[in-house]
Amino acid sequence: KFSKQSWGLENEALIVRCPRQGKPSYTVDWYYSQTNKSIPTQERNRVFASGQLLKFLPAAVADSGIYTCIVRSPTFNRTGYANVTIYKKQSDCNVPDYLMYSTVSGSEKNSKIYCPTIDLYNWTAPLEWFKNCQALQGSRYRAHKSFLVIDNVMTEDAGDYTCKFIHNENGANYSVTATRSFTVKDEQGFSLFPVIGAPAQNEIKEVEIGKNANLTCSACFGKGTQFLAAVLWQLNGTKITDFGEPRIQQEEGQNQSFSNGLACLDMVLRIADVKEEDLLLQYDCLALNLHGLRRHTVRLSRKNPIDHHS
């Protein structure tokens, strides 16, 4: 849990974060585990420690090894390990698996590829992006902040993407590259007439007088992002806000969930301190989208307290 693999290429900058975190004000000591030798904090050194960060400017193959970091808080010392491997630069275009960061998937609607580890570096835009070693050109590709956006993604866009940027440390510039695979998943979204999962039509909900009660209106509208979809409660055909009973409130904000890939929404109706007159009301769960509106009606009934006989 408190050990982390990091890798880089020789003659590039590599910055590693201690796997044990702490407040920015905590002292962090770094050691080269094999020799227990302390890593200096002076920036004139090629390898130096800077708080939670260990910096190789630039990295050398001989830097490979396990580094120990100790985060010292006023109450505890917490130890982490950074397993660093520096590789020789490949002469050919092929990026070996051991240099690859995690694979990301995209779809027609969402095609962001984040440049891995970039947040550790002091870099300035723009980022350079390459696919299978070719510089990306054309209006479909947009380098935005720390990620690449691909418009109108197609299956042919799958492949290995490399970001290249410059890290600046005290006026000196160091190159950094990072590569990850991008896969394209086919996400055909669709929209359906709303399906209310809860409550059941004409459901009778048992409540206790004087207690609080919650009713959940839950409906699904299709697959993928929905352009227009909403669930809400009505009391006797009136919006909750217009009904004017402060004890009865809809939960602010609709929870969106994707169950089995379906886009669903739910809205909770909270009734505080249930009163007799609440049993006379009609509670309507409404689900609506571009296809239309579906309504399920609920009524409340008094729950009889169970007598416990010894």
Partner: antibody, heavy 121, light 107 residues
Framework: QVQLQQSGAELVRPGASVTLSCKAS????????MHWVKQTPVHGLDWIGT????????AYNQKFKGRATLTADKSSSTAYMELSSLTSEDSAVYYC??????????????WGQGTSVTVSS | DVVMTQTPKFLLVSAGDRVTITCKAS??????VAWYQQKPGQSPKLLIY???NRYTGVPDRFTGSGYGTDFTFTINTVQAEDLAVYFC?????????FGGGTKLEIK
Amino acid sequence: QVQLQQSGAELVRPGASVTLSCKASGYTFTDYEMHWVKQTPVHGLDWIGTIDPETGDTAYNQKFKGRATLTADKSSSTAYMELSSLTSEDSAVYYCTRYSYTNSPYGMDYWGQGTSVTVSS
Amino acid sequence: DVVMTQTPKFLLVSAGDRVTITCKASQSVSNDVAWYQQKPGQSPKLLIYYASNRYTGVPDRFTGSGYGTDFTFTINTVQAEDLAVYFCQQDYSSPYTFGGGTKLEIK
């Protein structure tokens, strides 16, 4: 949502011990330190100590060292504080509080409702 | 131990007033200072961390400042619901210590 549920009020005899519990829910128990704080009308808030539930490591205020023992049970996400050799000076409300040290906000961001301990013969 | 000397002990103010509470540390505590509010019958609540950062959901009338040994907590337009005791606390060195508290009362 994050909740720290503390055990109920205690009436104990001088010289006895008491164990207070604090059940955490709504977050990963091992990702935060659990601290214990004593409050009296006269002395205000007094930090007793802390436990790292991940490792079981503890740190104490010297004032309470030897009398306070902090433990944590990862399986039930519950922290405990045992206070021994009680005197009337230990009559107070005791709070457990979650301490965030890995990310913002840094500090005691959630508190239990407090447990009142009365030491009396 | 770091002693946190909080002043004043009591404050009697009118709604709409500006209130300032100070905390002086017996030695430098960098900016590792938090401020808590404790309403009658309740547990303390975190308002400010790292001397000047407002905790989530805390109204912007509450502000904190300071570094080293001198810290200030301000309520810019006091409201009736601000009736409470306010504490400062340092977590720069162990044992963590609290100020004695300031009881804010509304006229």
